[in-house]
């Protein structure tokens, strides 16, 4: 069989949720391998995922160093086998990714309702503060630690017996809402960063309803 040319990567795409960040690209390699490099605008190009036949590279460890920085990645195509390099002067082909700013662009993961507690006609709903892979002083920060007051949660709640939804908002991880005595309610929450222009909202959490295990009911 004759030689083929190395081909440049294309469709470079950032996939990121709660700062877990993977660069994906095409095509599946034939007689070639890839090495990824990542850099900030002012930094060095650091090689990662050396000589791989994968079409993805986990860059989480790099972007969590400073989630407010803007990153650029590039994917090099290296001949491996019966191929010819099509780069000029022996230079390998590469393709640049779009820029990526984790703080502004990482998707907000689906939140989880940690608990709810009814005391009379008040219900306290608590959203789990999910751990991220962002570190400070060797400990992993939560989503709230990273985003602070930029992150709000919207609570959707409704009587089990009806479909009319009400909403509440909080810039903490807790809601305190008024309910009708003797009624069971269902809850769902959504994470939101209002200041963003893209990826502003998470998907809704799984629905939790009173009268099930998660909650606690106290008649005062």
């Amino acid at each position: 069989s004759g030689t083929t040319n190395t081909v440049a990567a294309y469709n470079l795409t950032w996939k990121s949720t709660n700062f877990k960040t993977i660069l994906e690209w095409e095509p599946k390699p034939v007689n070639q391998v890839y090495t990824v490099q990542i850099s900030t605008k002012s930094g060095d190009w650091k090689s990662k995922c050396f000589y791989t036949t994968d079409t993805e590279c986990d860059l989480t460890d790099e972007i969590v160093k400073d989630v407010k920085q803007t990153y650029l990645a590039r994917v090099f195509s290296y001949p491996a086998g019966n191929v010819e390099s099509t780069g000029s002067a022996g230079e390998p082909l590469y393709e640049n990714s779009p820029e990526f700013t984790p703080y502004l662009e990482t998707n907000l993961g689906q939140p989880t309702i940690q608990s709810f507690e009814q005391v009379g006609t008040k219900v306290n709903v608590t959203v789990e503060d999910e751990r991220t892979l962002v570190r400070r002083n060797n400990t992993f920060l939560s989503l709230r630690d990273v985003f602070g007051k930029d992150l709000i949660y919207t609570l959707y709640y409704w009587k089990s017996s009806s479909s009319g939804k009400k909403t509440a908002k909080t810039n903490t991880n807790e809601f305190l809402i008024d309910v009708d005595k003797g009624e069971n309610y269902c809850f769902s929450v959504q994470a939101v960063i209002p200041s963003r222009t893209v990826n502003r909202k998470s998907t809704d959490s799984p629905v939790e309803c009173m009268g099930q295990e998660k909650g606690e009911f106290r008649e005062i």
Epitope: V33, D44, K46, Y51, Y78, P79, A80, G81, N82, V83
Partner: antibody, heavy 117, light 106 residues
């Protein structure tokens, strides 16, 4: 011109500590991973690991994890390989080599380490 | 770890002979390099990415293979080719070298 210049030959006793160096010049030292390779007398090459000078991230061959430590001093463009307690079995030639693709290939001249009582 | 087994470990050949060195990997490898080392010298990259000749390497050298079996071939051995040749895989960490093949003059 890219150059990697390693420190001179060392003769040590078992149990002693040692730090050998590899100074890079003619390129952006912080931009390239630096490999370390061991060659015991009359034997083949063994990849020990590598370090990225900009942030000191290391990828270490687990075979060497309790034996040697990689470090860098960015301010003087120098990579180091060190031992806290040498053994006779550490007697070898040690090479540093810049991690490069393809025909680019830069190795230090090697440092001979002899450990003998 | 991926083990690389080179064979033969040494060979004696004459100038003009065709020489083949094999490197067998314990699991599949997608990126293989070959190095040449002469006594008292640092190794030099000789073939990279399975079949690409490094700069200045004569065309009598060639590399081939895939999966677990790789070869370095010298079509017509020359005096300057007498050296030790090592394969190295860079497909998975830790990167590993073969044990080497010493090519000697018959």
């Amino acid at each position: 011109e890219v150059q990697l210049v390693q420190s001179g030959a060392e003769v040590k006793k078992p149990g002693e500590s040692l730090k050998i160096s590899c100074k890079g010049s003619g390129y952006s030292f912080t931009s390239y991973w630096m490999n370390w390779v061991r060659q015991m007398p009359g034997k083949g090459l063994e990849w020990m690991g590598m370090i990225y000078p900009a942030d000191s991230e290391t990828r270490l061959n687990q075979k060497f994890k309790d034996q040697a430590t990689l470090s860098v001093d960015k301010s003087i463009s120098t990579a180091y390989l060190q031992w806290s307690s040498l053994k006779a079995s550490d007697t070898a030639m040690y090479y540093c080599a810049r991690e490069d693709y393809g025909s680019s290939d830069y190795w230090g001249q090697g440092t001979t380490v002899t450990v003998s009582s | 770890d991926i083990q690389l087994t080179q064979s033969p470990s040494s060979l004696s050949a004459s100038v003009g002979d065709r020489v083949t060195i094999t490197c067998s990997a314990s699991s599949s490898v997608s990126y293989m390099n070959w190095y040449q080392q002469k006594p008292g010298k640092s190794p030099k990259i000789w073939i990279y990415g399975i079949s690409n000749l490094a700069s200045g390497v004569p065309s009598r050298f060639s590399g081939s293979g895939s999966g677990t079996d790789f070869t370095l071939t010298i079509s017509s051995l020359q005096p300057e080719d007498f050296a030790t040749y090592y394969c190295q895989q860079k497909s998975s960490f830790p990167w590993t070298f073969g044990g080497g093949t010493k090519v000697e003059i018959k």
